[in-house]
């Protein structure tokens, strides 16, 4: 469900939302951290009936369903793991 | 302006079947989740099962899932409640409900009910 | 299932007053919480989303908050037309499930 991208590009989000989406509706989250082009972190709500939200990253749902997913990743794997998307 | 009309409803005997129907109108019905909840005379509002677009995801209330089938049909518009083995205590009005997964995540439009009496 | 409480069941409040509702819920609902106003012989109208955003067309006087476990809404204040009885919902997971309901009367 967790991804992070390491991309060259600028900026993808232009409005973004800080509304909570349940997890049944949410196909994948993609995290674009800051750099690059980019002075902020993205995050990238990829939903399942297709279309896809840019999410506030400082929204507290999004904060606190990362952090569910860090520490169920982390009792799992021994390190978190990072897809690299090559630019 | 959007519309969700049920039917179906009515007196039926205890053991008996019934298959509430819904139309809908003014939305683009093939794109959303639709739900089910009902209201038991004096209650409260108890939801029932939810269906996605395209009929691949299905959710029940736990104790109605052997009893209560949930379907939908998009080239018509319509969402349905197949209701088996019917006991005194479905007597309700049953709404059908249009779950956004949009903007709000939840209920925001709502049909203005049918009424099922179990009774003998 | 997650369950809902929803305090007080009912309310007796005059013209004007601040109306607070809570629901305590079960377990961790992130802020999957709405909030319904349904008046008698009618369907439910969605009032508040996401634990704190007001529907489209709903006015300033509606109010909600919190996250987690305890929910708030509020009335900041009532009006006659807001005689009903309001419903908080969880809708994180399924199965989806409502308080029980707080019934507002006016004094």
């Known amino acids: 469900v967790l991804e992070v991208y390491y991309t060259s590009l600028r900026c993808r989000c232009v409005q973004e939302s800080s509304v909570f989406i349940p997890r049944r509706f949410i196909d994948r989250i993609q995290i674009l951290p800051r750099g690059n082009g980019c002075p902020r972190k993205e995050i990238i709500v990829w939903k399942k009936n297709k279309s896809i939200v840019c999410v506030d990253p400082q929204a507290e749902w999004i904060q606190r369903m990362m952090e569910v997913l860090r520490k169920r990743s982390s009792s799992t794997l021994p390190v978190p793991v990072f897809k690299r998307k090559i630019p | 302006e959007v519309q969700l009309v049920e039917s179906g409803g009515g007196l039926v005997q205890p053991g008996g079947s019934l298959r509430l129907s819904c139309a809908a109108s003014g939305i683009d019905f093939s794109r959303y989740w639709m739900s089910w909840v009902r209201q038991a005379p004096g209650k409260g509002l108890e939801w029932v099962a939810e269906i996605n677009p395209e009929s691949s995801t299905i959710n029940y209330a736990p104790s109605l899932k052997d009893r209560f089938t949930i379907s939908r049909d998009n080239a018509k518009n319509s969402l349905y409640l197949q209701m088996n083995s019917l006991r005194a205590e479905d007597t309700a009005v049953y709404y059908c409900?249009?779950?956004?997964?949009?903007?709000?995540?939840?209920?925001?439009?709502w049909g203005q009910g049918t009424t099922v009496t179990v009774s003998s | 299932d997650i369950q809902m409480t929803q305090s007080p069941s009912s309310l007796s409040a005059s013209v004007g007053d601040r109306v607070t509702i809570t629901c305590k819920v079960s377990?961790?609902?992130?802020?999957?919480v709405a909030w319904y106003q349904q008046k008698p012989g009618k369907a439910p109208k969605l009032l508040i989303y996401?634990?704190?955003y007001r529907y489209t067309g709903v006015p300033s006087r509606f109010s909600g908050s919190g996250s987690g476990t305890d929910f708030t809404f509020t009335i900041s204040s009532l009006q006659p037309e807001d005689i009903a009885t309001y419903y908080c919902q969880q809708y994180y997971s399924t199965p989806l499930t409502f308080g029980g309901g707080t019934k507002l009367e006016i004094k």
């Open positions: 377990q961790d609902v992130n802020t999957g």
């Open positions: 996401s634990a704190s």
């Open positions: 409900a249009r779950q956004d997964d949009y903007l709000t995540y939840t209920m925001d439009y």
